[in-house]
């Protein structure tokens, strides 16, 4: 087969008109959308046969695949045609128009598809978007195709800018069925049960009407059989369930159960198992390790949480220095136990606004009639450090005197300094260090008592200064865990007139 | 949430006629159009038509057409796929499916078989 002009793509321009030519060694005719549009066809004397076609007044209508195939007199096509692509850009026409099953892409499998947006000249600048988004995806685009890969089970529009004008193409659906033709869950009124206690499974077949349920667990292994019972779901259409009940469990009833389900339309089956655990009595264990001395900042809040296993459901109290806490009204403490797996709880005391008042020993206790845990810790309220004083005297001996007084919880370290060039430092120059035994020209002496009332250090410390002979800052600087604040004084030589 | 749930499997002769019925639920039964789409064995899902709810249109597959009607009760949200003139080669499950925009919703199937 020869084409003239042989493309295989060819630009056009709108209300042109043009001439396709296809010959071969048999009768050939042009094709355009499975259909023979209006041709001449002759036959040369050399014997080949041509067909020529005449594009006239194109529009941008006129975009798309034409074919040359050999048509043989008897009927019988063979395999060899020649494909040809026309774009007819046309600022008229934004997307080619698609049939109605184009919109609609029904899918069984994860799959590469192509979502058949076209326009009409190749120039354009084409972007596929989730109908209900803005952002354009990363697909690949093909000007004679469309965009192709794997798609979500979504809504696509495609855009386009023809001149000044934003184009949107119709939406195009993918539909994907969902082939896991059954699909099964296994679930238990409980995983867990005391012996003499019931266990109670039930199996659940969704969106499939003629199934075949068949339950394996460790009383069949020894013979002896329990009949289950199926049942209908009617407020869920086509939820098929099968329940396995198991009156007075036995320690040998712990184990795997399994449901298999098999379906015969189309011959598929799926299985789910769960574990079964049948104990001799109910427990109670701690999980995870609470250190048994707990920290709390003053005026913030404070959360204390226990993490423990149990079966059955256990009551849980809490208790500070021997008496029962309970959500005060007030807001300041407030206690929760809550489920967060089948056996597994999580207990908390939230303590608002931590007040001195509330350190102390503190006690978790969870119980049950089968058993019982308990876990206690000492709360310490933590105060950030504040200076409460730092003054400076002169005594009769000569030397000068600083005085700093702190508090904070824990107890707070003292750190002196002091700037001997005012200009100079702290920016630029390092405060020097006061108070180390090798210095003979400062002393320090430290006191620290602690208030049990308020729970809480002080300190006390004086700096004597053997001699002052030019102004010196002197700064005092309290530190602890929670934080520390600093004052600083000046103090000036006996010998100048401004002391 | 949105559900459809089709009614149940049917055996039919050659050149008899079948009924599909899709109910809808959990979402106004007018706003999305309702597709119907077989599954012969071994094949893979060839699409039939469409029906709009709320004017009643329809548009079939070429293959389908004058073989297929379909039509709806909007007073019970239900849509319905009559098929005409079967033979063995429309032995398939039947689905009807509609399209939320964010995810396509499907109906659990209905097995017609035709045999003699």
């Known amino acids: 087969l020869v084409v003239t002009p042989p493309g295989p793509e060819l630009v056009l321009n709108v209300s042109s008109t043009f001439v396709l030519t296809c010959s071969g060694s048999a009768p050939v005719v042009w094709e355009r959308m499975s259909q023979e549009p209006p041709q001449e066809m002759a036959k040369a004397q050399d014997g080949t046969f041509s067909s020529v076609l005449t594009l006239t007044n194109l529009t941008g209508l006129d975009t798309g695949e034409y074919f040359c195939t050999h048509n043989d007199s008897r009927g019988l096509e063979t395999d060899e045609r020649k494909r040809l692509y026309i774009f007819v850009p046309d600022p008229t026409v934004g997307f080619l128009p698609n049939d109605a099953e184009e919109l609609f892409i029904f899918l069984t499998e994860i799959t590469e598809i192509t979502i058949p947006c076209r326009v009409t000249d190749p120039q354009l600048v084409v972007t596929l978007h989730e109908k209900k988004g803005d952002v354009a995806l990363p697909v690949p685009y093909d000007h004679q195709r469309g965009f192709s890969g794997i798609f979500e089970d979504r809504s696509y529009i495609c855009k386009t800018t023809i001149g000044d004008r934003e184009v949107d193409s119709d939406a195009y659906y993918v539909y994907r069925l969902q082939v896991s033709s059954i699909n099964v869950s296994v679930n238990a009124v409980q995983t867990v049960v005391r012996q003499g206690e019931n266990i109670t499974l039930m199996c659940i077949v969704i969106g499939n009407e003629v199934v075949n349920f068949e339950w394996t667990y460790p009383r069949k292994e020894s013979g002896r059989l329990v009949e289950p019972v199926t049942d209908f779901l009617l407020d869920m259409p086509y939820h098929i369930r099968s329940i396995l009940h198991i009156p007075s469990a036995e320690l040998e009833d712990s184990g795997t159960y399994t449901c298999n389900v098999t379906e015969s339309v189309n011959d598929h089956q799926d299985e789910k198992a769960i574990n079964i655990t049948v104990v001799e009595s109910g427990y109670v264990r701690l999980l995870g390790e609470v250190g048994t001395l707990q920290f709390a900042e003053l005026h913030r809040s404070r959360t204390l949480q226990v993490v423990f296993e149990a079966y059955p459901p256990p009551t849980v109290l809490w208790f500070k220095d021997n008496r029962t806490l309970g959500d005060s009204s007030a807001g300041e403490i407030a206690l929760s136990t809550r489920n967060v797996s089948e056996t597994r709880y999580v207990s908390e005391l939230t303590l608002v606004r931590v007040k001195v008042a509330e350190a102390g020993h503190y006690t978790m206790r969870a119980f049950h009639e089968d058993a019982e845990v308990q876990l206690s810790f000492q709360l310490q309220i933590n105060v950030p450090v504040r200076v409460l004083e730092l003054s400076e005297s002169h005594p009769d001996s000569g030397e000068q005197t600083v005085r700093c007084r702190g508090r904070g919880m824990p107890q707070p370290n003292i750190i002196w300094s002091a700037c001997r060039d005012l200009k100079r430092c702290p920016r630029e120059l390092p405060p020097t260090l006061l108070g180390n035994s090798s210095e003979e020209e400062s002393q320090l002496e430290t006191n620290v008592t602690y208030w049990e009332e308020e729970q809480e250090f002080e300190v006390v410390s004086t700096l004597r200064l053997q001699h002052v002979d030019r102004p010196l800052s002197v700064r005092c600087t309290l530190r602890n865990a929670v934080g520390q604040d600093t004052q600083e004084v000046i103090v000036v030589p006996h010998s100048l007139p401004f002391k | 949430q949105m559900q459809l749930v089709q009614s149940g499997a049917e055996v039919k002769n050659p050149g008899a006629s079948v009924k599909v019925s899709c109910k809808a639920s959990?979402?106004?039964?007018?706003?999305?159009?309702i597709q119907w789409v077989r599954q012969a064995p071994g094949q893979g899902l060839e699409w039939m038509g469409w029906l709009n709810p709320n004017s009643g249109d329809t548009h079939s597959a070429q293959k389908f057409q004058g073989r297929v009607t379909m039509t709806r009760d909007t007073s019970i949200s239900t849509a319905y796929m009559e098929l005409s003139g079967l033979t063995s080669d429309d032995t398939a499950v039947y689905y009807c499916a509609t399209h939320g925009g964010d995810r396509s919703y499907w109906g659990q199937g209905t097995l017609v078989t035709v045999s003699s």
């Open positions: 959990g979402y106004p039964f007018s706003a999305y159009y």
